[in-house]
């Protein structure tokens, strides 16, 4: 017993004055607590606790389950203990079969011995299976066997406590180790869709999936820049060991424009946090916005192809699309498709394929699209560039030479005189009169230009060239002059 100063309270004395006592099964346990201020005896083994208010603890016929720590406490709260082993050949271990271990922590296999004099007190795998190579343990006859630094791989490991008693190996009841995983990563969070577009009054519902090693992960939906508690519904399940999944579904039954914003699904565990967001846009009504992918004024050469392409945003989804020319609807030559296969896609593409365009096929081509809320359209003005064509070239009765040419863009007519038999007409002749004949006519056809020169200006034999040209090409017509004496012969026009 410890020595103390006079007047200072001291712990009680126990008889027999030993720290440990071994009693055979069936024999008596008699423990005496000597203290003027005796309060109680306490017995502890595994999770069991018993009390006795008498200063002498007597168990007439000791059983293995009487093995444990007996503590005597006095009125000053001071105590002394003795550990009693009740040796029972038929019951070497006391067991509490519940066995949990927190990952990376130590855990106790509770199989205290009833006989401290056995040897090889250790752990063994069930059915002769070896224990994991890295499993380390420390035996303590009074408490059990401590597994050091529990690994996740030990989950559901089947174990026995084992000891050699009189040369024979004795096994306890089996233990199944349940490992409580440590959080070693942030939760994995994902959302059903990254963005939502709705009309007022429609239901907004979005699901966040949270995955972690256990259900003790915390999760919630939050509205950015708002503290309002959102209405959530949950489902959860275990896909197996350390594979827990929760679905948190956020619902706004009738969305309003002011519900628009960013919603965050937030999850955290002891390792850290993770989040994912979804964006809600609520519009008061649907819309269609059309974006031409080429200029709406199109110039194309005669015989060539052109594709009229639009992209458009439509919400709700488009119901009718058509391409129109001169009040006629195209049944083919066009295609319409979504810009992406994404579920939340609202962008579409429409293409009209015009092939080998003729000069007569210029005009306004209109794309029309509608959904349940709105209609929209866009027009393309298509001009077909054509090489000039000389429609007429005549000598008029008044002696004028006249050339009429048609084409697009508007042709320019130049006049040249070639003296004698020269083929090269280099000397230009200024026209007397130039007119655009159909400037006020339909806007997309060929433009007709008329140009005249005075033939009386020519005094020698030769050829007059009327040359019509534009950006696409050129065409010429010729007038031949022949003089006989002072008389001008008939002029022969040719191209």
């Amino acid at each position: 017993q410890p020595s103390v100063s006079p007047g200072e309270p001291s712990p009680p004395s126990i008889h027999p004055a030993k720290s440990e006592l071994i009693v055979r099964v069936g024999n008596e346990i008699r423990l005496l607590c000597i203290d003027p201020g005796f309060v109680k005896w306490t017995f502890e083994i595994l999770d069991e606790t018993n009390e006795n208010k008498q200063n002498e603890w007597i168990t007439e016929k000791a059983e293995a389950t009487n093995t444990g720590k007996y503590t005597c406490t006095n009125k000053h709260g001071l105590s002394s203990s003795i550990y009693v082993f009740v040796r029972d050949p038929a019951k070497l271990f006391l067991v509490d079969r519940s066995l949990y271990g927190k990952e990376d922590n130590d855990t106790l296999v509770r199989c205290p011995l009833t006989d401290p004099e056995v040897t090889s007190y250790s752990l063994k795998g069930c059915q002769g299976k070896p224990l994991p190579k890295d499993l380390r343990f420390v035996p303590d006859p009074k408490a059990g066997i401590t597994i050091k630094s529990v690994k996740r791989a030990y989950h559901r490991l089947c174990l026995h406590c084992s000891a050699d008693q009189e040369g024979k190996s004795v096994l306890s009841d089996k233990f199944i180790l349940k490992v409580r995983p440590a959080f070693k990563a942030v939760p994995v969070v994902s959302v059903s869709k990254a963005s939502y577009l709705l009309r007022e009054g429609e239901e907004f519902t979005v699901t966040c999936t949270i995955k972690d090693v256990s259900s003790s992960v915390y999760s919630t939906w939050k509205r950015e820049n708002s503290q309002t508690k959102l209405q959530e519904k949950y489902n959860s399940w275990h896909h197996g060991d350390f594979n827990y999944e929760r679905q948190a579904t956020l619902t706004i039954s009738s969305a309003r424009v002011n519900d628009s914003g960013v919603f965050m699904c937030y999850a955290n565990n002891t390792f850290g946090s993770a989040n994912v967001t979804t964006t809600l846009e609520v519009v008061d009504k649907g819309f269609i916005n059309i974006f031409p992918m080429i200029n709406t004024t199109v110039f194309v050469n005669d015989g060539e192809n052109v594709d009229l392409i639009v992209e458009y945003e439509a919400f709700p989804k488009p119901e009718h699309q058509q391409w129109i020319y001169m009040n006629r609807t195209f049944t083919d030559k066009w295609e319409d498709y979504p810009k992406s296969e994404n579920e939340s896609n609202i962008r579409y593409v429409s293409e009209l394929h015009l092939t080998r365009l003729k000069g007569t096929e210029g005009g306004t081509y209109t794309f029309l699209v509608s959904n349940s809320d709105v209609n929209a359209s866009i027009a393309f003005n298509v001009y077909v560039n054509t090489k000039p064509e000389i429609l007429t070239y005549d000598r008029l009765v008044n002696g004028m030479l006249q050339c009429v040419a048609a084409g697009f863009p508007e042709p320019t007519i130049d006049w040249y005189f070639c003296p004698g038999t020269e083929q090269r007409c280099s000397a230009s002749v200024l026209p007397v009169d130039v007119q655009t004949l159909n400037a006020s006519g339909p806007p997309f056809g060929k433009l007709v230009v008329q140009s005249s020169i005075d033939s009386s200006a020519f005094k020698h034999n030769g050829t007059v060239e009327c040359k019509a040209y534009n950006d696409v090409g050129k065409t010429s017509a010729y007038f031949n002059f022949a003089f006989k004496g002072n008389n001008k012969e008939q002029i022969h026009p040719h191209t």
Epitope: R180, S215, S216, Y218, Y234, N235, H238, Y244
Partner: antibody
Framework: EVQLLESGGGLVQPGGSLRLSCAAS????????MSWVRQAPGKGLEWVSA????????YYADSVKGRFTISRDNSKNTLYLQMNSLRAEDTAVYYC????????????WGQGTLVTVSS | DIQMTQSPSSLSASVGDRVTITCRAS??????LNWYQQKPGKAPKLLIY???TLQRGVPSRFSGSGSGTDFTLTISSLQPEDFATYYC?????????FGGGTKVEIK
């Protein structure tokens, strides 16, 4: 020692409301999910609702969804069940139960409180 | 929802008998099955969790087995205090569901 004590049961008319409480002691309340389980007279057990340790996640049986709300106050070690729009078929003994670790069942139960819905 | 079907709904047995109760899930629940014992006028008591793990303080005459959809509770030698109603329950996914119960009566 783990203890769960329900209160708040009684007689209520159809369409009425009632709030059950469950006072917990003997363990770290916020570490455990909690559930309500009910048993109609002479019938089997029916799980009603559950709530995670932090109170963040809540779960309901289809039969009570939209009418019952589970909540907890970890500072008071108390679990609640707010029951609205009560029906005759909600008549039962309501038990509060502690959820053990992931999927390991309800390891501690209260003694139950009787809710009678009748006109 | 996952349906849990217990059979039989009741059985008569004598002290010392070996009793077997089965529980079938409508879809796989891995090993997330629990067994409870309930005596008249009392709250249920957890016997077995994780299909086969005995809850602390439960006598070793009780055992559980099974995985996936089919599970069994066995009482190796029925004792007078074992006459009660037994329920299985899945904790695999919400909503959690109980079987209809099996009443074990004295023959």
């Amino acid at each position: 020692e783990v203890q769960l004590l329900e209160s708040g049961g009684g007689l209520v008319q159809p369409g009425g409301s009632l709030r059950l409480s469950c006072a917990a002691s003997g363990f770290t309340f916020s570490d455990y999910p909690m559930s309500w389980v009910r048993q109609a007279p002479g019938k089997g057990l029916e799980w009603v609702s559950a709530i995670g340790g932090s109170g963040g996640d809540t779960y309901y049986a289809d039969s009570v969804k939209g009418r019952f709300t589970i909540s907890r106050d970890n500072s008071k070690n108390t679990l609640y069940l707010q029951m609205n729009s009560l029906r005759a078929e909600d008549t039962a003994v309501y038990y509060c139960a502690r959820g053990a670790y992931d999927g390991e069942g309800f390891d501690y139960w209260g003694q139950g409180t009787l809710v009678t819905v009748s006109s | 929802d996952i349906q849990m079907t217990q059979s039989p709904s009741s059985l008569s047995a004598s002290v010392g008998d070996r009793v077997t109760i089965t529980c079938r899930a409508s879809q796989t629940i891995s090993g997330y099955l629990n067994w409870y014992q309930q005596k008249p006028g009392k709250a249920p008591k957890l016997l077995i969790y994780d299909a086969s793990t005995l809850q602390r303080g439960v006598p070793s005459r009780f055992s559980g087995s099974g995985s996936g959809t089919d599970f069994t509770l066995t009482i190796s030698s029925l004792q007078p205090e074992d006459f009660a109603t037994y329920y299985c329950q899945q904790n695999y996914r919400t909503p959690f569901t109980f079987g209809g119960g099996t009443k074990v009566e004295i023959k």
